[in-house]
């Protein structure tokens, strides 16, 4: 071996200088009487080597690297050998940092594994092999005086936690615990923890269970859940407080916390929840009032709250068949009385015959908002309820009475926009209790079964805005009926469009008489369409062969018109425009020719 490198230190702080010397023995100088020693760090040649011949004939080169910025590199001492570089010796250099003080040291006592598990954060990377040791001792007091040392706990490589087994622990007695970090550049120690392993106990959570329904126990109220929890048996004797968290399974709701709760709740009713909703529940506990750590959250329990009976008002309206007055069509609308009024599963219409205590005869059971049934001859009243699995709404009585109340007057309707109509009236005297407003397509598409209806509870109302099922260019029939205490008034109706169409076509023009300079025209007006706005006027247009146009406006009641001042023997094109407020439509064009000067008048 010809050469040998020695370094000031093989491991230094990252960025620090390092000095190295390379000595080449005399017996190697046959390579070259004055060999030039070269330095290489990694793959790069390093200038700055100072070379000298020593008294014993050996050659020495010394180099100082001002900053070692590689965490690991090989420093080589070389000679040129022909065209290649011959490495005589090399050393591994390492650079890094002394260990930072380990921080956030914390410990948990696990009663299942009977060990104290401590973990820490090692701090920034040192770039050097660094060992961590969990050190501890037993202490009688508050760790000021050190008792028996406990065997060091050395974590597996790369781990920042270590378990002290039970045989090295003393429960209900303090232990001093710290972490020592060590590498070639130094040693550091974390702040010392002083703890009784039982004060850092982490329990297992209880197991949540649903309450088995017992025959004598009342079922949970709507929006409530009955549950219980089975404490973790090994922690049964440890006083604990627990907390429950719950959230609806659907939606984005966050967890709601309930606590503190006792560990030993034989049963617990959780209320204030949404009815008929699936919930996820979890529980966790902590040693208390003595110190401890929260357990993990328990496995989830999934439970559904019971629903509440519908809390709705049912607005009702009915119609009798004209051909069979005992056949009644009953309509209703549920109006929620509370924000959460309960799910409605269906509706039942029933009748209680007089003199039959308790006997209730169902007339129909439906999920629709109407039903048709035959009213028994002695029945003057039926009851309507909404129901679900939790019960029924309060019954709504429906009394079938004659129209004996006063009628409203001056019923009128006007368009608000293409999708709404305002219907107004003058209230009768005395004031009704309210009104039923029905609307649906008028003739020719009229149908009793397709009517929309609304209840107006305010008897002093003088109008109502119809916003449902209103489309432009359709004729609507609107029926308003006043409602009184035990009866109703006669129904009134009106027709209206929310947006009218222009007349669909104008009358055909016919030539009645013609002369040399005049022509008499006539037409048959279109029959008025019910509810369509009437024609406001006609305009007649005529054009001569020279393309000169003339027109005249006629009132809507006109049936004919005479064109004067025409040229004899001339061709004219004539058409009629029928106009209403909604627009205008042209007739087909009539073409005629006036008579020649020598011709006789045609009548």
């Amino acid at each position: 071996e010809c050469g040998h490198i020695s370094v000031s230190a093989p491991i230094v702080h990252l960025g620090d200088p390092i000095t190295a010397s390379c000595i080449i023995k005399q017996n190697c100088s046959h390579l070259d009487p004055e060999p030039q020693i070269l330095w290489r760090l990694g793959a790069e040649l390093q200038p700055g080597g100072r070379q000298q011949r020593l008294s014993d004939g050996t050659q020495e080169s010394i180099i100082t690297l001002p900053h070692l910025n590689h965490t690991q590199a090989f420093l080589s001492c070389c000679l040129n050998w022909g065209n290649s570089l011959q490495i005589l010796d090399q050393v591994e250099l390492r650079a890094g940092y002394p260990p930072a003080i380990p921080h956030n040291l914390s410990c948990l006592m696990n009663l299942t594994t009977s060990s104290l598990i401590c973990q820490w954060e090692p701090g920034p990377e040192t770039h050097l092999p660094t060992s961590f040791t969990l050190k501890s001792f037993k202490s009688r007091g508050n760790c000021q005086t050190q008792g028996d040392s406990i065997l060091d706990c050395v974590p597996k490589d790369g781990q920042s936690h270590c378990c002290i087994p039970r045989k090295h622990l003393l429960l209900y007695q303090n232990m001093g615990i710290w972490v020592q970090a060590e590498n070639a550049l130094g040693t550091s120690m974390s702040p010392q923890l002083c703890l009784d392993p039982m004060d850092v106990v982490k329990l297992e959570p209880p197991m949540l269970r649903t309450m088995d329904p017992s025959p004598e126990a009342a079922p949970p109220q709507a929006g409530c859940l009955q549950l219980c929890w089975e404490p973790w048996q090994p922690g049964l004797h440890i006083n604990q407080k627990c907390e429950l968290r719950h959230k609806p399974q659907r939606g984005e709701a966050s967890w709601a916390l309930v606590g503190p709760l006792p560990l030993e709740a034989l049963q617990y009713e959780l209320c204030g929840l949404l009815p008929a909703t699936a919930y996820t529940l979890q529980i966790r506990c902590i040693r208390w009032p003595l110190p401890g750590h929260w357990s993990d959250w328990s496995p989830s329990l999934e439970l559904r709250t019971t629903e509440r009976a519908p809390t709705v008002r049912l607005d009702t309206w009915w119609r009798q068949r004209q051909l069979d007055p005992r056949t009644v069509q009953l309509f209703w609308k549920p109006v929620p009385l509370e924000e959460d009024s309960g799910r409605i599963q269906g509706y039942v219409v029933s009748w209680r015959p007089s003199g039959q205590a308790g006997a209730i005869l169902p007339l129909c059971n439906t999920t629709e908002l109407s039903c048709t049934f035959h009213l028994p001859s002695e029945a003057q009243e039926v009851a309507l309820v909404a129901y679900n699995s939790a019960g029924t709404s309060r019954p709504t009585p429906v009394v079938f009475s004659e129209s004996r109340g006063p009628a409203l007057t001056r019923l009128h309707a006007m368009a608000r926009d293409p999708h709404s109509l305002w219907v107004g009236w003058e209230p009768p005297n005395p004031w009704p209790q309210g009104y039923v407003i029905e609307w649906g397509l008028g003739p020719p598409s009229a149908s009793n079964s397709n009517k929309t209806w609304r209840m107006e509870q305010n008897g002093r109302a003088t109008g109502f805005l119809l916003k449902e099922n209103i489309r432009p260019f359709q004729l609507y029939e609107i029926i308003v009926t006043p409602l009184y205490q035990d009866t109703m008034g006669p129904s009134q109706h009106v027709y209206a469009y929310s947006q009218e169409m222009a007349p669909s076509h104008a009358p055909e023009l016919h030539l009645k008489h013609i002369g040399k300079t005049w022509a008499q025209l006539e037409w048959v007006p279109e029959p008025p369409e019910l509810g369509k706005s009437p024609l406001t006027h006609y305009t007649i247009f005529w054009t001569n062969a020279q393309n000169q146009s003339f027109s005249a406006i006629l009132n809507a009641s006109s049936r004919g018109f005479v064109l004067h001042g025409l040229e004899p023997a001339s061709l004219y094109h004539i058409h009629l425009m029928a106009a209403s407020q909604a627009g205008a439509t042209n007739s087909t064009v009539l073409t005629l020719m006036t008579l020649t000067p020598e011709g006789s008048e045609l009548h």
Epitope: L111, T112, T113, S114, R166, K167, L171, M198, P231, Q233, P234, L236, H237, I238, N239, P262, E264, A265, L266, R287, P289
Partner: antibody
Amino acid sequence: EVQLLESGGGLVQPGGSLRLSCAASGFTFSLYWMGWVRQAPGKGLEWVSSISSSGGVTPYADSVKGRFTISRDNSKNTLYLQMNSLRAEDTAVYYCAKLGELGMMQSWGQGTLVTVSS
Amino acid sequence: DIQMTQSPSSLSASVGDRVTITCRASQGISSYLNWYQQKPGKAPKLLIYYASNLQNGVPSRFSGSGSGTDFTLTISSLQPEDFATYYCQQSIEYPAHFGGGTKVEIK
């Protein structure tokens, strides 16, 4: 210093009833589980029943289930054992014990003798 | 139920002897094993809890070991006051059965 003092033992006929009491002092009674252990003459120790700090959990040995009732009055620092339908095999010294957090019986009373005999 | 079996049921030993008593659980009980000492006519006294923790005031010649199902109580050097009956008990769940006891007598 923890002190537990049992009372209420004595002679009772089979089928009879007896109520044992255990007066506790020297510790915060309401924070600890308590229990009863018995020892028949010349025999080993037999766990009878325990009660949680608030009284909500009360496990029993199969041999006494349905006949004995454990209870406590935290305001009086007193533990009770109501024994009904007593049998000859219930004859024993009954010890009251304070339980630790890991279920161990940390402190014991001096015991009270219950004799069931006709 | 977890049954506890102690052995031997009795043993004779001399002062200064090292004495070992074993206790076996019918199923794993982690470290939830306690040892009690009872002298004739007296109430039992807790010696060791949670398998190896010495109760305050108990001499250090007493030690406990084991976990799971097999446990040992060791008296490193028997003293005259140690002649008594020793019981093990599991406390991981109810019913909290005791072992049958081991009577340590003077040889």
